[in-house]
């Protein structure tokens, strides 16, 4: 037969197998067995149950030192096997056997699923000698029981190298059932279905769920634990829960919030961080990113000119930095700049836009007409030349950049000349003789030194060979020139 | 498959008491909420109330408390609606509706004709 | 109790043409049902969780809508599609129906 004493008046299953006795409680002894003075046992159990056969380890003492007798075999008392009882609760039970005292040094350990209990527990062990035997009760106390107290406990005696084990006295601990897997909040496509889970454990079992969504029942009827919920869609933001319940009450997950992804909202600040003739450097802010990561971004440039035709020019960038080098605009002029960026979804709208100018540049175009004459008399070599069409972007002429290089038997030097807008002809000395020089010229601005020219070449003889046929720029097309002497 | 089978048409008197059944089949019973549905005469569809399968507890709407009860045999998958004390304003078409998550009738009976009349 | 008011009480269609029946509530639902009921058989799962079409419904139809405003749509009307059109709410209890839509095909 299989007792129980329980908590409350409510029909509970047996466990079964080796399980010999069943106990609900929370409090208070069930009854007293011998005890030193100072010492009472809050949780006592009952001793042999008569007509059961013993199954657990025993050991068989030899024969006394007396040489005439037998013992009989040694082995724990029966206890109660299961004990149930509510988190917080102090609980105590015990295992007690009787050791002929023939035998020293006996010592009782506690072991809970196969693992010695060690250190900072109560346990405590009495001892009750008598002529023959000593009765030893082995005690273990748990105050505020937890979940993690659950388990198998036994007792464990050695003596003279046998171990005796006793039943196992099975606590369970039962409480509010406790989660292991709560939904999750999630960014979700609109009307796109998904899924939530939840699990929670007792005991006691078993743990019903229900779901709640925006603090409405989504199941009128609970689903065992574990419980998935596909959720057929979403067009608004919602908040999901799950309660868990079982006989000890319910527990209530946290609240998750569902997004709806949407199109990103347009980025902000966009700001200039350096132009050039060709270039503007811009930045921004990006916006809400609409609960889906951005993946890229489109800068958008329009020129601000009521001549030009209005088209605007795109450039796609990546999402970060959030920073672009607008390229290949023309110089000395104004544009509006925006910019818009995506993410899954879609496109934001664009950004406020705003105005930005790039600077003066170099002029595109180089001087015309390049004529190089030897001046023989005054050793030098005059060189004449047209001023460049320059478009109004390039800004105001400043002057020319002249470079003349000098050859001559492996020796190779280039020399650079700056002369004023003003001029169109410019005198250089004669650097080396017996020698080519060879002549560019370069328009230049505030914007920069425009292209050079196409090379001039002229051969300065030694002292007293006079030529002064001018070499010049060749027409379009034509090789190299050369002064033919 | 799943099948909600409602029991025939009644005739019946004013004063008098009808009891229509639902038996349900190709799903677990306990585990689906049966809800009930009225039709009468040229009107719309009018929610009386659900069973909850699993505890057996009945929720009426407003307007069906009284008179009007939901009991379950689990034992043969059945829900019934019994009417108390009929009146002419009960003749009507009864659904018996299986509800499913977010209150989606996924299944529905064939219905049952309870006509009142003296 | 959240009511539910549809229009139009009765809808004349023609076959190919697109129609749309709406379906307010007196507030906020979380979802919005659809079921056809013809003379003579019970209503039918027609639209579940406002935009999901039951199994076996064609694919001419469409439901949409948030809040306290949904709608259902049928993109080219077909001769089979006469019927009563039935909304209801899932939010709160009790469980309240529409009064329905009745399409008339011409």
């Known amino acids: 037969a299989i007792t129980e004493a329980r908590e409350e008046a409510k029909p509970y299953p047996l466990f079964p197998g080796p399980l010999p006795g069943s106990l609900q409680t929370d409090h208070t002894s069930l009854l007293s067995l011998p005890h030193t003075s100072g010492y009472q046992p809050a949780l006592m159990f009952s001793p042999t149950q008569p007509g059961r056969p013993y199954t657990g380890n025993v050991a068989i003492p030899r024969v006394t030192s007396a040489g005439s007798k037998l013992l009989p075999p040694l082995a724990f008392k029966h206890t109660v096997g299961h004990i149930i009882l509510s988190e917080h609760k102090d609980v105590k039970f015990n295992c007690s056997i009787s050791v002929p005292n023939i035998y020293q040094d006996t010592t009782i350990s506690w072991w809970k699923d196969g693992k010695e209990l060690l250190g900072a527990h109560h346990a405590i062990t009495q001892f009750y000698p008598d002529d023959e035997v000593t009765a030893i009760i082995a005690s273990f106390s748990i105050t505020s029981v937890q979940r993690s107290d659950n388990g198998s406990y036994i007792c464990k005696m050695k003596i003279n190298n046998e171990e005796i084990v006793s039943d196992p006295i099975y606590i369970e601990v039962q409480g509010l059932p406790h989660f292991t897997k709560q939904p999750e909040s999630m960014n979700v496509t609109r009307n796109t279905a998904f899924n939530l889970t939840c699990q929670a454990v007792g005991p006691p079992e078993p743990v019903n769920i229900f779901w709640v969504q925006n603090s409405s029942r989504v199941n009128e009827q609970p689903e065992k634990s574990p419980s998935v919920l596909t959720v057929p869609g979403l067009t608004e933001m919602a908040v999901f829960s799950c309660e868990a319940h079982n006989d000890k009450g319910l527990t209530v997950s946290k609240g998750v919030q569902i997004n709806i992804k949407a199109i990103p909202s347009p980025p902000t600040e966009v700001s200039i961080h350096n132009s050039t003739a060709h270039s503007i450097l811009i930045s921004w802010v990006p916006g809400f990113d609409g609960y889906s990561p951005f993946r890229n971004c489109s800068v958008q440039v329009k020129e601000v000119d009521p001549l030009s035709n209005g088209s605007v020019m795109i450039f796609n960038t990546s999402a970060s930095p959030h920073m672009y080098q607008i390229k290949q605009l023309q110089a000395l002029a104004n544009y509006s700049i925006g910019v818009s960026c995506m993410n899954e979804i879609g496109w934001s709208a664009v950004s406020p836009w705003i105005l930005a100018s790039t600077t003066e540049g170099a002029p595109s175009v180089a001087p015309l007409n390049v004529t190089v004459f030897l001046n023989e008399s005054r050793d030098n070599v005059d060189i004449r030349w047209m001023k460049p069409l320059t478009k109004r972007q390039a800004g105001e002429l400043v002057g020319y950049r002249i470079s003349h290089v000098w050859q001559s038997a492996g020796i190779s030097k280039e020399l650079l000349e700056e002369v004023g807008q003003n001029n169109s002809r410019a005198q250089i000395s004669v650097q080396v003789h017996n020698a080519t020089c060879t002549v560019r010229i370069a328009a230049v601005t505030k914007g920069g030194v425009g292209p050079f020219s196409d090379p001039v070449k002229i051969f300065i003889p030694a002292h007293g060979w006079v030529d002064h046929a001018p070499s010049s720029t060749p027409a379009p097309g034509n090789a190299d020139p050369v002064l033919i002497i | 498959q799943i099948q909600l089978v409602q029991s025939g048409p009644e005739l019946k008197k004013p004063g008098e008491t009808v009891k229509i059944s639902c038996k349900a089949s190709?799903?677990?019973?306990?585990?689906?909420?049966m809800s009930w549905v009225h039709q009468a005469p040229g009107k719309g569809l009018k929610w009386l109330g659900w069973?909850?399968?699993?505890?057996?507890?009945?929720t009426y709407a407003d307007d069906f408390r009284g008179r009007f009860a939901f009991s379950l045999d689990t034992s043969v998958s059945t829900a019934s609606l019994e009417i108390n004390n009929l009146q002419n304003e009960d003749t009507a078409t009864y659904f018996c509706?299986?509800?499913?998550?977010?209150?989606?009738?996924?299944?529905w009976g064939q219905g049952t004709l309870v006509t009142v009349s003296t | 109790q959240i009511v539910l008011s549809q229009s139009p009480a009765i809808l004349s269609a023609s076959p190919g043409e697109k129609v749309t029946m709406t379906c307010r509530a007196t507030?906020?639902?979380?979802?919005m049902h659809w079921y056809q009921r013809k003379p003579g058989s019970s209503p039918k799962p027609w639209i579940y969780a406002t935009s999901n079409l039951a199994s076996g419904v064609p694919a001419r139809f469409s439901g949409s809508g948030s809040g306290t405003s949904y709608s259902l749509t049928i993109s080219r009307v077909e001769a089979e599609d006469a019927a009563t059109y039935y909304c209801q709410q899932w939010s709160s209890n009790p469980r309240t129906f529409g009064g329905g839509t009745k399409l008339e095909i011409k």
């Open positions: 069973i909850n399968t699993y505890s057996g507890v009945p």
């Open positions: 507030s906020s639902v979380g979802y």
């Open positions: 190709g799903y677990t019973f306990t585990s689906y909420g």
């Open positions: 509706a299986r509800e499913d998550n977010w209150a989606w009738f996924a299944y």
